[in-house]
């Protein structure tokens, strides 16, 4: 299980409309459910139940976003509509270029994501927990545009992002 280096860029807008970018670094792990690849895109928070809908909307998602899913305690969802792996698969089907799971409340999900799959996803499936997960969710819960870059080696430069 390799370390995933995640850089999150937050676009902070001032009342005048100017904006600055803030970069936060955190680490997670690449799970065996997906590929150990770099990926980047805008962060879109997805509720675990939001991944249950199986309808015609699935092909309507544009490619290239990074899905962030905070998993709930297993007791709160005793009969999940999909396994954690199934949720990752559904997000990728919908166009996610990567999926990041916050497993702090559901550490058992780590084993589910790391069970050797004969057909792993072609996109990275990363899990975060503890302080890194708190950092990530604090960013995701802000009313800001945020972008994630996932790398499988430490970033060379902390701000390789666009000049806005």
């Amino acid at each position: 299980k390799e370390t995933a280096f995640v850089e999150v860029v937050l676009f902070e807008s001032s009342p005048s409309g100017d904006y600055t970018t803030y970069t936060t670094g955190l680490t997670g792990r690449f799970s065996r459910a997906g590929a150990t690849l770099s990926a980047e895109g805008e962060i879109v928070q997805m509720h675990p139940l939001g991944l249950c809908n199986n309808n015609d909307e699935e092909d309507l998602y544009e490619y290239g976003w990074v899905g962030v899913v905070k998993l709930e305690q297993p007791e709160l969802d005793p009969k999940p509509c999909l396994t954690v792996l199934g949720k990752a698969k559904r997000a990728v089907q919908r166009g996610a270029t990567a999926v990041i799971f916050d497993v702090s409340e559901n550490p058992e999900a780590i084993d589910q994501l790391n069970q050797g799959s004969e057909d792993p996803l072609k996109r990275p499936v990363v899990y975060v927990k503890g302080a890194d997960a708190i950092k990530l969710m604090n960013i995701v819960n802000k009313q800001k545009v945020a972008r994630a870059r996932i790398q499988h080696r430490p970033p060379r430069q902390p701000t390789e992002y666009f000049d806005m």
Epitope: S38, A39, E62, F162
Partner: antibody, heavy 117, light 112 residues
Framework: EVQLVESGGGLVPPGKSLKLSCSAS????????MHWIRQAPGKGLDWVGY???????IYADAVKGRFTISRDNAKNTLYLLINSLKSEDTAMYYC???????????WGQGVMVTVSS | DIVMTQSPFSLAVSEGDMVTIMCRSS????????????LAWYQQKPGQSPKLLIY???TRQSGVPDRFIGSGSGTDFTLTISDVQAEDLADYYC????????FGSGTKLEIK
């Protein structure tokens, strides 16, 4: 079927404000970022600004401070408030679906705003 | 902001001809994170809203005829229309969405 329908345009005197709406249907609106793009008569396309699924906003330099993009996910509606209208704001305004660093696959039919006394 | 330089401004061709429209960006649009070029091509017919033709520089949007071909990487991109049809009469725009989005100035395609 994805549909985006703009409304609220018309003839407005300079200096006034106007609020455009874009009603969305056929997709989970709350999961999407949305853009406003405008096109002055006989001219090219100009990006105006963006609102993320969680209501973060980014604007083009030309409109900063005067334009405000908002959304009401419960009503599946995107808004563009234009303050202190100028003649150069005369354009067809389109809403389009897509993430900030994404392309726009779906566009509305556009709504015309004419600023003139 | 990234500047998109599109050429030519207009061109008139006969049905069956091949057309090439160029777009050059002031900086690379190739993402090191996913190796995709953040460039799209749009067609806008008179009185209509723009329609997506090509995304990621070379991927044709579903339903778009295969005579529309996008190519290029980094800073130089091309839209080629082979076997031009009367219904291709339109304005064509490139869009960079690597950072704050910017469109090319547009190319007006006229049929002789």
């Amino acid at each position: 079927e994805v549909q985006l329908v703009e409304s609220g345009g018309g003839l407005v005197p300079p200096g006034k404000s106007l609020k455009l709406s874009c009603s969305a249907s056929g997709f989970p609106f709350s999961n999407y970022g949305m853009h406003w793009i405008r096109q002055a008569p006989g001219k090219g396309l100009d990006w105006v600004g963006y609102i993320s699924s969680n209501s973060g906003t980014i604007y083009a330099d030309a409109v900063k401070g005067r334009f405000t993009i908002s959304r009401d996910n419960a009503k599946n509606t995107l808004y563009l408030l234009i303050n202190s209208l100028k003649s150069e704001d005369t354009a067809m305004y389109y809403c389009a679906r897509g993430y900030f660093d994404g392309y726009y696959r779906f566009w509305g039919q556009g709504v015309m705003v004419t600023v003139s006394s | 902001d990234i500047v998109m330089t599109q050429s030519p401004f207009s061109l008139a061709v006969s049905e069956g001809d091949m057309v090439t429209i160029m777009c050059r960006s002031s900086q690379s649009l190739l993402s090191s994170g996913n190796q995709k070029n953040y460039l799209a091509w749009y067609q806008q017919k008179p009185g209509q809203s723009p329609k997506l033709l090509i995304y990621h520089a070379s991927t044709r949007q579903s339903g778009v005829p295969d005579r529309f071909i996008g190519s290029g990487s980094g800073t130089d991109f091309t839209l080629t229309i082979s076997d031009v049809q009367a219904e291709d009469l339109a304005d064509y725009y490139c869009l960079q969405h690597y950072s704050s989005p910017t469109f090319g100035s547009g190319t007006k395609l006229e049929i002789k």
